[in-house]
C-alpha cells in the first residue's frame, strides 16, 4: 500500500521538517523559518507557537516539532500543553477579581494556587480540635471530647477474669 501510495502521491515522500510545494512541482521544500511539520507528507508547515508575555519558552521550535511554553516565575500553567498562565498567590490567599486576597476566617489554602477551602469540621467525625486552623493550614482533629474527659484512659482495660469451673476451650 505504501508503495502504491507513493507512486500516486509524490508528496508522501516528503519527510517531517519539509512540505510538499505545489508551486514547485510538488518538490519537498524545507519548512520556512518559524514553522514546522511533525509528520511526513504535509502540504503545509504549521506556524511555531510563540511564548510571549507571561509565557516563556521551555523548548525551542524546530523544523520537526513545535515550541513548548511554560509560565514565567510567579505564574503556573493551566490547561493542556500550558495553554494558560495563572498568577500565583501566597499560601493563605486565593486569586479573586481583585487579585490575590487573604482567605476568609474559617478557610485556608496551603498552596500558591487554587481557592480557599473550609477548615475541617472535627465535630462531624465526633472529634475535637487539637490544633487550630490558620489561613495557611487546616485544623488538626484530635480524639473525641469523651476520650478526653476526666478519668478516661486510653489504656485498654484488662480482659474480664474467666468464671471458675470453666476450662479453656
Amino acid at each position: 500500500f505504501e508503495r502504491t501510495r507513493s507512486l500516486q502521491d509524490p508528496c508522501s515522500n516528503c519527510p517531517a521538517g519539509t512540505f510538499c510545494d505545489n508551486n514547485r512541482n510538488q518538490i519537498c521544500s524545507p519548512c520556512p523559518p518559524n514553522s514546522f511539520s511533525s509528520a511526513g507528507g504535509q502540504r503545509t508547515c504549521d506556524i511555531c507557537r510563540q511564548c510571549k508575555g507571561v509565557f516563556r519558552t521551555r523548548k525551542e521550535c524546530s523544523s520537526t516539532s513545535n515550541a513548548e511554553c511554560d509560565c514565567t516565575p510567579g505564574f503556573h500553567c493551566l490547561g493542556a500543553g500550558c495553554s494558560m498562565c495563572e498568577q500565583d498567590c501566597k499560601q493563605g490567599q486565593e486569586l479573586t477579581k481583585k487579585g490575590c486576597k487573604d482567605c476568609c476566617f474559617g478557610t485556608f489554602n496551603d498552596q500558591k494556587r487554587g481557592i480557599c477551602r473550609p477548615w475541617t469540621n472535627c465535630s462531624l467525625d465526633g472529634k475535637s480540635v487539637l490544633v487550630n486552623g490558620t489561613k495557611e493550614r487546616d485544623v488538626v482533629c484530635g480524639p473525641s471530647p469523651a476520650d478526653l474527659s476526666p478519668g478516661a484512659s486510653s489504656v485498654t482495660p484488662p480482659a474480664p477474669a474467666r468464671e471458675p469451673g470453666h476450662s479453656p476451650q
Epitope: R49, C51, K52, G53, V54, F55, C69, L78, C82, S83, M84, C85, E86, Q87, L95, T96, K97, K98, G99, C100
Partner: nanobody, 122 residues
Framework: EVQLVESGGGLVQPGGSLRLSCAAS????????MSWARQAPGKGFEWVSS???????YYVESVKGRFTISRDNAKNSLYLQMSSLRAEDTAVYYC????????????????WGQGTLVTVSS
C-alpha cells in the same frame, strides 16, 4: 499583523504621575478585553489592571485608588493613568489582550506589547 505599542514611561519622583498609552492595531480592539501587567526588576510578572470591552474595570489591591485604566475605542488605544507613584511601582509595564476574562490569567493566544519602563525614584 497584531501590534501593541506602549509609550509614556519614564523617570518620575515618588508621589508623581504618569500616563501610559498602548496603541493597538491588527485586531478588533473595541470588542477585546485588555489588561496591563508589570514586571519589576529581577521579579516576576504581576497583573495590574484589566478592562472589559464594556468598560468594566479591575485592579490589583496595591494600585486601587491610584491607577485608572481606560480605553478609547475610536483611537484603538488603552491607557493607564498612574498617580501617587511609589518606588515599588518601578517596573516594565506591558499592555496585553485578555481573552480569558479571568483576573491574573492569560491565554497563549493573547498578544503582548514590548513594554515601557517606569522608574519611580528621587
Amino acid at each position: 499583523e497584531v501590534q501593541l505599542v506602549e509609550s509614556g514611561g519614564g523617570l518620575v519622583q515618588p508621589g508623581g504621575s504618569l500616563r501610559l498609552s498602548c496603541a493597538a492595531s491588527g485586531f478588533t480592539f473595541s470588542s477585546s478585553a485588555m489588561s496591563w501587567a508589570r514586571q519589576a526588576p529581577g521579579k516576576g510578572f504581576e497583573w495590574v489592571s484589566s478592562i472589559y470591552s464594556s468598560g468594566k474595570t479591575y485592579y490589583v489591591e496595591s494600585v486601587k485608588g491610584r491607577f485608572t485604566i481606560s480605553r478609547d475605542n475610536a483611537k484603538n488605544s488603552l491607557y493607564l493613568q498612574m498617580s501617587s507613584l511609589r518606588a515599588e511601582d518601578t517596573a516594565v509595564y506591558y499592555c496585553a489582550t485578555w481573552k480569558t476574562l479571568r483576573v491574573g490569567v492569560w491565554d497563549e493566544s493573547d498578544y503582548w506589547g514590548q513594554g515601557t519602563l517606569v522608574t519611580v525614584s528621587s
